[in-house]
């Protein structure tokens, strides 16, 4: 906290300019008018203040706006944003995407801080949903943003926003998140033709049910092994050898290298060895010939 002292003669700041970098903290406190600072916030970002000097400028704004800063000030905070606490940010009402972009730009290249997380939360809650433009912006700055949301939060993403999602945005998503996103993607891309549809839907397939995988197997999609390995085990298990062969196309040979890993390992255990042998890959561990396969899940459903 900087003591209240009178401004020395001739040091009262008529405007926010670079001469202020020579001011000590107490001089900034005494000689810079808070209302002037608020109207000339855009200049602060171009002046190489020290971190300590920014503390004083923040303190002046806090005194001027105890209920939270107006958006006209927030948009021009620049590096002063790094001084804000999540508690400060919770007082704000940020509605403009331009304001959001300006503040994310300040934090660019760094991990998502608690301040940024709070800002995004306030912004999205203010909008009521995660619309396409917002999602576009957030994933541009934080490719992992989507996967940081809970399945409940993801449920507020409208299908139209899915067009903004890039494959790398889903890299860290877990199956529960993809379960929520996949139906939205399916809806968003439903009017695309087969090959274009597959390109778009591919990164969401970790949430696809068995029936959709069966449908894809009829469309010559040639799914790569990396995508196949991310599919839900429970969705892969009911697929026949013929369906998996059609689904993977020329990539089917990759099954051999993955035969000890899920979901391939579990899928192999469910197939007849005879059927696996038709692939000519030397996959082992299928059900020996002559054994009766009981579908216990079906039996449980009937009882």
């Amino acid at each position: 906290e900087v003591e209240k002292t009178a401004c020395p003669s001739g040091k009262k700041a008529p405007e926010i300019d670079e001469s202020l970098i020579f001011y000590k903290k107490w001089e900034l406190e005494a000689c810079v008018d808070a209302a002037l600072l608020a109207t000339q916030m855009d200049r602060v970002n171009a002046i190489p203040f020290t971190y300590e000097q920014l503390d004083v400028l923040k303190h002046k704004l806090d005194e001027l706006y105890p209920q939270g800063y107006p958006e006209s000030v927030i948009q021009h905070l620049g590096y002063l944003f790094l001084k804000m606490s999540p508690e400060d940010i919770r007082k704000w009402n940020v509605t403009s995407l331009e304001t959001l972009k300006a503040l994310l730009e300040v934090n660019k290249g760094h991990e998502m801080s608690p301040q940024v997380a709070t800002l995004i939360d306030r912004f999205v809650k203010g909008r009521g949903q995660l619309d396409k433009d917002t999602l576009d912006t957030l994933t541009a700055f934080y490719p992992g943003y989507l996967c940081s949301l809970s399945p409940e939060e993801l449920s507020s993403v409208p299908p139209s926003s899915i067009w903004a999602v890039r494959p790398q945005d889903l890299d860290t998503c877990d199956p529960r998140q993809l379960d929520v996103l996949y139906p939205k993607a399916r809806l968003a891309f439903q009017n695309m033709n087969g090959s274009e549809y597959f390109v778009k839907i591919q990164s969401f397939l970790g949430g696809a049910p068995t029936e959709d995988l069966k449908a894809l197997s009829q469309q010559n999609v040639s799914m790569d092994l990396a995508t196949f390995m991310k599919l839900r085990t429970d969705a892969v298990l009911p697929l026949t050898v013929a369906e998996v062969q059609k689904l993977l196309g020329p990539h089917v040979e990759g099954l051999k290298a993955e035969e000890r890993h899920r979901p391939v390992r579990d899928w192999i255990l469910r197939q007849r060895q005879d059927d696996l042998d038709t692939l000519g890959l030397g996959l082992q561990g299928g059900i020996p010939n002559g054994y009766l396969v009981l579908d216990l899940s079906m039996q449980e459903a009937l009882s």
Epitope: I21, I47, P48, F49, T50, G78, Y79, L82
Partner: nanobody, 116 residues
Framework: QVQLVESGGGLVQAGGSLRLSCTAS????????MGWYRQEAPGKERELVA????????NYADSVKGRFTISRDNAKNTVYLQMNSLKSEDTGVYYC?????????WGQGTQVTVSS
């Protein structure tokens, strides 16, 4: 991150002179706007004493005007602070800084002690 290394500090009698140097590891050094700061004691505020921009234009704190001169040698990636007529109140650790908004990295500093 650009490394800044300050040197040239030491113990000097009041009225004496010292020349501080700050060398940067960055090749695009000539484009940088540079400043020298003084910190009287640990925990106290760093005060800006002099700046020099890319065109060689300089500015000084009132307390050092006429006594200190800041200069630069872009070929050597170095900025200097020539300190004459030193006073006991000039004692402190001197740091150079790349005067870039949002840049708050400092070198290790060089101690200047002026005895009266």
């Amino acid at each position: 991150q650009v490394q800044l290394v300050e040197s040239g500090g030491g113990l000097v009698q009041a009225g004496g002179s010292l020349r501080l140097s700050c060398t940067a590891s960055e090749s695009g050094f000539s484009a940088n706007y540079m400043g020298w700061y003084r910190q009287e004691a640990p925990g106290k505020e760093r005060e800006l004493v002099a700046t020099i921009n890319r065109f060689g234009s300089t500015n000084y704190a009132d307390s050092v005007k006429g006594r200190f001169t800041i200069s630069r040698d872009n070929a050597k990636n170095t900025v200097y602070l020539q300190m004459n007529s030193l006073k006991s109140e000039d004692t402190g650790v001197y740091y150079c800084r790349i005067m870039r908004p949002g840049n708050w990295y400092w070198g290790q500093g060089t101690q200047v002690t002026v005895s009266s």
